[in-house]
Interface confidence: medium
C-alpha cells in the first residue's frame, strides 16, 4: 500500500526507503524521500529540505505540490514531465528555492496546472519559453490562471546584460500562451517601467499586482483592453502623478479598484487633473490616505483636500535670467 495517510495528517517517506527501491521503477503512489504526502488531500510537501532537483518519484495523485525553501538552482525542460503525466497537478509552489534559471518548457506536460508561484527566487535567466513551452509564434494555450512572480529580481551583479523587465515580459507574452491568465503578481521586482505591449496581450487579467516596484510613470501603459480587471495594485512605487489619459482609461474599466498608497505624489500644477478626478472617482481604494511628498511646502498634505490654488508650478525663468 502507498505510504499515505488521512487528510488530516501527512506521511513522510524515510530516506532509506527511497534508496532501497531506487533501482526499480518508482511505485506510482509512493512518497518521495524528504517529502510529506497526503493522498486524501492530494498534497505533497517537500519544504525546506535543501533539495537540488525535483523528485522524480512524485505520486500521480498530486494536485498541490509545495517545493519551497530548497536549492533547486535550475529548472530544466520537462522538470515535471512524468510517465504517466502528473495530470492532476493544479498548484505548484516553488517559492524561495534559490532558482536562478528556468529553461524553456520547464512546465510542459502539466495539463491541469492553474497556479504557479516562483516568488523569492533570483531569476537571472527566465527563458522566454518558460511558460509557453515552445518558440512557436502561437503556442498551445497554457492552463495557467494564476502566476505569482513576486520578488524574482536577482541581485544587481547577477543580472544579464539586458532589461529585467524585458526578460519577464518576453516570458509572459511568448506564443500568446497566457491568454487565460487571470491573476499576475509582479510585486517587489524593482521594475522601472512597464513595457507598453504587455497588458494588451493578457486580456483575461482580473488582478494585477505591481506593488513595491519603482514605477515612475504610467504614461505609455494602456489599460484599455483589460475590461475584466478588478484590482490593480500600484502601492509603494515611485509614481509622481497620473495623467489624463491614464485617468480616463482607469475610469472606463467597469470593475476596477486601484490601490495607490505610498507613492511620492508631486503636488504642483500637473497634479490638478488627478486631484479633480480623485474627488469624483470611486475606483481608488483608500483615496483619503494619499498625500503629497513634494514640493517641500506641500509634504503630507492630503490630495483630496487640495484646491487648484494650492497646485502651482514655479514659473520657468527665461534663459537670460537663469543662473548656472
Amino acid at each position: 500500500s502507498s505510504p499515505t495517510s488521512s487528510a488530516s495528517s501527512f506521511s513522510s517517506s524515510a530516506p532509506f526507503l527511497a534508496s532501497a527501491v531506487s533501482a526499480q521503477p518508482p511505485l506510482p503512489d509512493q512518497c518521495p524521500a524528504l517529502c510529506e504526502c497526503s493522498e486524501a488531500a492530494r498534497t505533497v510537501k517537500c519544504v525546506n529540505r535543501n533539495l537540488t532537483e525535483v523528485p522524480t518519484d512524485l505520486p500521480a495523485y498530486v494536485r498541490n505540490l509545495f517545493l519551497t525553501g530548497n536549492q533547486l538552482a535550475v529548472l530544466p525542460a520537462g522538470a515535471f514531465a512524468r510517465r504517466p503525466p502528473l495530470a492532476e497537478l493544479a498548484a505548484l509552489n516553488l517559492s524561495g528555492s534559490r532558482l536562478d534559471e528556468v529553461r524553456a518548457g520547464a512546465f510542459e506536460h502539466l495539463p491541469s496546472l492553474r497556479q504557479l508561484d516562483l516568488s523569492h527566487n533570483p531569476l537571472a535567466d527566465l527563458s522566454p519559453f518558460a511558460f509557453s513551452g515552445s518558440n512557436a509564434s502561437v503556442s498551445a494555450p497554457s492552463p495557467l490562471v494564476e502566476l505569482i512572480l513576486n520578488h524574482i529580481v536577482p541581485p544587481e551583479d547577477e543580472r544579464q546584460n539586458r532589461s529585467f523587465e524585458g526578460m519577464v515580459v518576453a516570458a509572459l507574452l511568448a506564443g500568446r500562451a497566457l491568454q487565460g491568465l487571470r491573476r499576475l503578481e509582479l510585486a517587489s521586482n524593482h521594475f522601472l517601467y512597464l513595457p507598453r505591449d504587455v497588458l494588451a496581450q493578457l486580456p483575461s487579467l482580473r488582478h494585477l499586482d505591481l506593488s513595491n516596484n519603482s514605477l515612475v510613470s504610467l504614461t505609455y501603459v494602456s489599460f484599455r483592453n483589460l475590461t475584466h480587471l478588478e484590482s490593480l495594485h500600484l502601492e509603494d512605487n515611485a509614481l509622481k502623478v497620473l495623467h489624463n489619459g491614464t485617468l480616463a482609461e482607469l475610469q472606463g474599466l467597469p470593475h476596477i479598484r486601484v490601490f495607490l498608497d505610498n507613492n511620492p505624489w508631486v503636488c504642483d500644477c500637473h497634479m490638478a487633473d488627478m486631484v479633480t478626478w480623485l474627488k469624483e472617482t470611486e475606483v481608488v481604494q483608500g483615496k483619503d490616505r494619499l498625500t503629497c511628498a513634494y514640493p517641500e511646502k506641500m509634504r503630507n498634505r492630503v490630495l483630496l483636500e487640495l484646491n487648484s490654488a494650492d497646485l502651482d508650478c514655479d514659473p520657468i525663468l527665461p534663459p537670460s535670467l537663469q543662473t548656472s
Epitope: R183, S204, R206, H207, T227, H228, E230, S231, P254, H255, R257, F259, Q285, G286
Partner: antibody, heavy 116, light 107 residues
C-alpha cells in the same frame, strides 16, 4: 485548497436580525471580493451584494439596501453578512462566494428560517 | 438593473441528446457572462466564464457562446450526471443578476 466555511443554520422571529459568517482559507483573503447570494427553497439564485476584504468597501442590491450590512475581520479571514428586520420571505439558504466578477468558490450555505 | 431571461425554464431530454439553453440580457453585456450548474442540495458550480471559456475540470461536452445580449450554453451529449438546474449570471454591471434557471430533467 480554497475553502469557504459558513456558520450553522439559524431560526429567527420576524423583525429580528441574523448575522452569518464565512471563514475563508486556502488563499489570501484580502485579494478577492466576497459576494453573498441567497436562494429560497425551490427558487433561483439572488445576488445580494459584495464586500472587498482589503478596503472594507461594499455594494448592495437595491432590494436589500438599508437592511443588509457586509463586514469582515481580516485577522481571522472571516466575512459577515447581517440582515435586519427579517420577514418570512427572507427564509432562504444564504451563500457566500469568492470573486468580484463571476464567483468561483462557494460556501456550503447557511439556512436562515424566519418564523413566528 | 439588467434583466437576464433564460429559456426554456425546464426541458426533458435523454442521455446522449444535444441540449441548448439560452440566456438573453436586457442590454448589451459584452462577454461578461458565466454559466453555473446546481444539483439538488449542492452549491452552484461554475461551468463557463467570459461567455465561452470552459472552467478547468469541466467536461468538454459543455460549451458557451454569444456576446452582447444573446448567449447559449450547449451540452453536446447529455450524460446522467448533467441532470441539474443551470443558471446564467451577468457581471457587466452592478447589481449582478442571475437568470431564473433552466431545469434539465430526464425524459
Amino acid at each position: 485548497q480554497v475553502q469557504l466555511v459558513q456558520s450553522g443554520a439559524e431560526v429567527k422571529k420576524p423583525g429580528a436580525s441574523v448575522k452569518v459568517s464565512c471563514k475563508a482559507s486556502g488563499y489570501t483573503f484580502t485579494t478577492y471580493d466576497i459576494i453573498w447570494v441567497r436562494q429560497a427553497t425551490g427558487q433561483g439564485l439572488e445576488w445580494m451584494g459584495w464586500m472587498n476584504p482589503k478596503s472594507g468597501n461594499t455594494g448592495y442590491a437595491q432590494k436589500f439596501q438599508g437592511r443588509v450590512s457586509m463586514t469582515r475581520n481580516t485577522s481571522i479571514n472571516t466575512a459577515y453578512m447581517e440582515l435586519s428586520t427579517l420577514r418570512s420571505e427572507d427564509t432562504a439558504l444564504y451563500y457566500c462566494a469568492r470573486g468580484g466578477l463571476e464567483p468561483d468558490y462557494w460556501g456550503q450555505g447557511t439556512l436562515v428560517t424566519v418564523s413566528s | 438593473d439588467i434583466q437576464m431571461t433564460q429559456s426554456p425554464s425546464s426541458l426533458s431530454a435523454s442521455v446522449g441528446d444535444r441540449v441548448t439553453i439560452t440566456c438573453r440580457a436586457s442590454q448589451g453585456i459584452r462577454n461578461d457572462l458565466a454559466w453555473f450548474q446546481q444539483k439538488p442540495g449542492k452549491t452552484p458550480k461554475r461551468l463557463i466564464y467570459d461567455a465561452s471559456n470552459l472552467q478547468s475540470g469541466v467536461p468538454s461536452r459543455f460549451s458557451g457562446s454569444g456576446s452582447g445580449t444573446e448567449f447559449t450554453l450547449t451540452i453536446r451529449s447529455l450524460q446522467p450526471e448533467d441532470f441539474a438546474t443551470y443558471y446564467c449570471l451577468q457581471y457587466n454591471r452592478y447589481p449582478r443578476t442571475f437568470g431564473q434557471g433552466t431545469k434539465v430533467e430526464i425524459k
